[in-house]
Amino acid sequence: EKLPKAPVITTPLETVDALVEEVATFMCAVESYPQPEISWTRNKILIKLFDTRYSIRENGQLLTILSVEDSDDGIYCCIANNGVGGAVESCGALQVKMKPKITRPPINVKIIEGLKAVLPCTTMGNPKPSVSWIKGDNALRENSRIAVLESGSLRIHNVQKEDAGQYRCVAKNSLGTAYSKLVKLEVEVFARILRAPESHNVTFGSFVTLRCTAIGIPVPTISWIENGNAVSSGSIQESVKDRVIDSRLQLFITKPGLYTCIATNKHGEKFSTAKAAATVSIAEWSKSQKDSQGYCAQYRGEVCDAVLAKDALVFFNTSYRDPEDAQELLIHTAWNELKAVSPLCRPAAEALLCNHLFQECSPGVVPTPMPICREYCLAVKELFCAKEWQAMEGKAHRGLYRSGMHLLPVPECSKLPSMHRDPTACTRLPYLDYKKENITTFPSITSSRPSADIPNLPASTSSFAVSPAYSMT
C-alpha cells in the first residue's frame, strides 16, 4: 500500500510566447498520492472545464489554448490538491505576440491650407509596432510641422500646398510589417493676394496700370472696384499660370481714387475672398519702406536655383501674403529684363539680385537675413555692370532695369555692411570670386566714391582689376 503524498509540482510553469491564432500549452507535472485534482486559473479567475477555447488533458496537467487571441495574455496558474497537505500552485505568463495590424487606417482628407490635418493610423501588435509614414514613394520626415503622434496618427500643423499627395502608414515590429492603403491628402487654398496693387502718385491725365496677383485652389477670379463701385472705365487684362491669376487694370487718371482688387474662389458651398486696395492720387508722394519680419526656409524656386547654394536657407519676407511665391514672381520678372544687359553683367547681376531677394539666413538670437557684402555689390556696380549702372543712374533710376511700370530695386551698396568690418555680417557672392580667378581681361574701373568704410587693400594679383576702394579678398 502506497503512503499518502502531498502534491509536488515537478515542472513549474514558464512564460509562454504565442502568436495570435496559434496554439499555446502550459504543462504542470504533479507528483502525489492519491492523484490530485488540478484546476487552472487565468488572472486568478477559474478556467471552466467545459470552455471550448481550452483543452485540459493528462489528468489536468496540460492546458492548451487552441487558438490564441490577443485578449488571452495574462498570468496562468495550475493548482494541485489531493487532500494531503496543502494545495500547491505554479504560475506562468502568456505573452501574446502579434504581427502588426492597422485597426484604424487613414482615410482621404481634404483640408484648407494653414489648418491642422490628422491622418489616423491606429495599430495593434506585440511588441508594440512602430509607425512611420510614406508620402508618394519616400519616407516622410518629421519636422517642426509634421509629427507622428504616439497613437501612430500623422499630424500636420499649418498645412501647406506641398503637403498634398498620397500617404500610407507603415506599422512594423519584429514579427512583420503592415501597410495601410494609399490615401490622398488634398490641400485647398483660400484665395489670397500674392501681389497687391501698388498705390501711385501721378500727374493729371497719366496712364496707370494697377496689377493684382492672386493664388488659390481652385484658381480665383479677380474683380476690381473703384471707390466702392464696379470699375466704369479702363481695360482689364488677365492671365493664369500655375494657379496664379494675374490681373492688370489700366486706367486713364483724371481724378484720385481708391481701387480694390477682390480675389474669390469656392470651397464646396462656401466662398473665400481676399481684398487689397491701392490709392491713385494726383499729388506728390513718397513711398516709405518699412523693414518687415519674415522666416527662413529652403529655397524651392527655380529662377535662382543655380545661383543660390544648394539647400540654402533663405529669408522670406512676410510683408508679402505668400512670400515664397511673391519673391519668386519678383525675381522672375527681373530675370526677363536682364536679357537685355551685356554677357559680362548678366550673371553678376543675377547673382546680386538672387542674393538680394533671397538673402541667406544666419542664426544667432533669431534667424535673420544677411545682406550682401558691400564689396561684392560694388564689384557688380563698378566692374561687371559699370556701363549699365551708369546708364541707369543717368536716368535717375534706382533699379538695374525697368519692368513695365515697376522698378525692382537693387541694393544700395553704401548701405550694406563691409566684410572687412564684420565678415559674419554679410553674404559673399561666390560667382564673383570664381570670375575673379578665371577671367583674364577686365576694364580697369575706378571708383567714383571711395568709401571710408572699405580699406584700400591691394587688388588681386590676377588681371581682375578691382577699384582701389575695395578688394574682393
Epitope: C361, G364, V365, M370, S418, R421, D422, T424, A425
Partner: antibody
C-alpha cells in the same frame, strides 16, 4: 580703423543703477550688430545682449529685465543701462562689434557693485 | 542653452610645439551649411580677439599657424597652433552663435614651458 571706447563704469551699491556708453568710430555704425559682453575678475566671458540694425534687442536670461541695450546711430553710440545691480554683476564690461562672431572688442569699462 | 566644454583646461607648450585645444558642444551648431563656432584669444591684460569664425575661417590679420577644424554636423571642434610662439601665451575661448544666448567655453590657458 575700427575703434570702440567704453565709459560709464564705476563703483555702485547693490540695487543701484549705472549707464554704460560705447562710442564707435572707423565704420558705418548703423549697419552692424553690436553686443555687450562681460568678464568677472579672474573668470571667463559672458555674453549679455545684442542689438541689431533695426534696434531690436536680445538679452541673456541673467540680465533680462534689469539691463537695457540701445543705440543712437546719429551719435555712433551704443548704450547699456544697468538697473537693480547685484554684487555678481561686478565685471569688466566690453562693447563688441559683430553679428555671429564677436569681431572687434573695446578695452572695457569696470563696474564694481559693493556696499 | 548650448553648453561648450573645453579641454584641456590648461596646457604648457614649448616654442615651435604644436598645440591643440578641443571644444565640445552639447548640440550641433550647424546652420545653413556653416558651423557657427568661433575661437578667441585673450592675452594677459588685453581684450579678447577673434581668431577663427565659422569653425575654420581665419579672421584677417591672424597668423596662419592658427587653424580651426570641425565640419558637418559634428559637435567636436579643434583650434590648432601649428608652431607655438611666445606671443601665443593667452587664454583661448570657443563660442557658439547658433542660438540665444550666445555662449562661451570656460577657456583654455596656454602657457610657455
Amino acid at each position: 580703423e575700427v575703434q570702440l571706447v567704453e565709459s560709464g563704469g564705476g563703483l555702485v551699491q547693490p540695487g543701484g543703477s549705472l549707464s554704460l556708453s560705447c562710442v564707435a568710430s572707423g565704420f558705418t555704425f548703423s549697419l552692424y550688430y553690436m553686443n555687450w559682453v562681460r568678464q568677472a575678475p579672474g573668470k571667463g566671458l559672458e555674453w549679455l545682449s545684442v542689438i541689431d540694425t533695426h534696434s531690436i534687442a536680445y538679452y541673456a536670461d541673467s540680465v533680462k529685465g534689469r539691463f537695457t541695450i540701445s543705440r543712437d546711430n546719429v551719435k555712433n553710440t551704443l548704450y547699456l543701462q544697468l538697473n537693480n545691480l547685484k554684487p555678481e554683476d561686478t565685471a569688466l564690461y566690453y562693447c563688441v562689434l559683430g553679428r555671429t562672431a564677436l569681431v572687434r572688442w573695446g578695452q572695457g569699462t569696470q563696474v564694481t557693485v559693493s556696499s | 542653452e548650448i553648453v561648450l566644454t573645453q579641454s584641456p583646461s590648461s596646457v604648457t607648450a614649448s616654442i615651435g610645439e604644436k598645440v591643440t585645444i578641443n571644444c565640445e558642444s552639447s548640440q550641433s551648431v550647424l546652420y545653413n551649411q556653416k558651423n557657427y563656432l568661433n575661437w578667441y584669444q585673450q592675452r594677459p591684460g588685453q581684450s579678447p580677439r577673434l581668431l577663427i569664425y565659422w569653425a575654420s575661417t581665419r579672421q584677417s590679420g591672424v597668423p596662419d599657424r592658427f587653424s580651426g577644424s570641425g565640419s558637418g554636423s559634428t559637435t567636436d571642434f579643434t583650434l590648432t597652433i601649428s608652431s607655438f610662439q611666445p606671443e601665443d601665451v593667452a587664454v583661448y575661448y570657443c563660442q557658439q552663435a547658433y542660438n540665444a544666448p550666445l555662449t562661451f567655453g570656460p577657456g583654455t590657458k596656454v602657457e610657455l614651458k
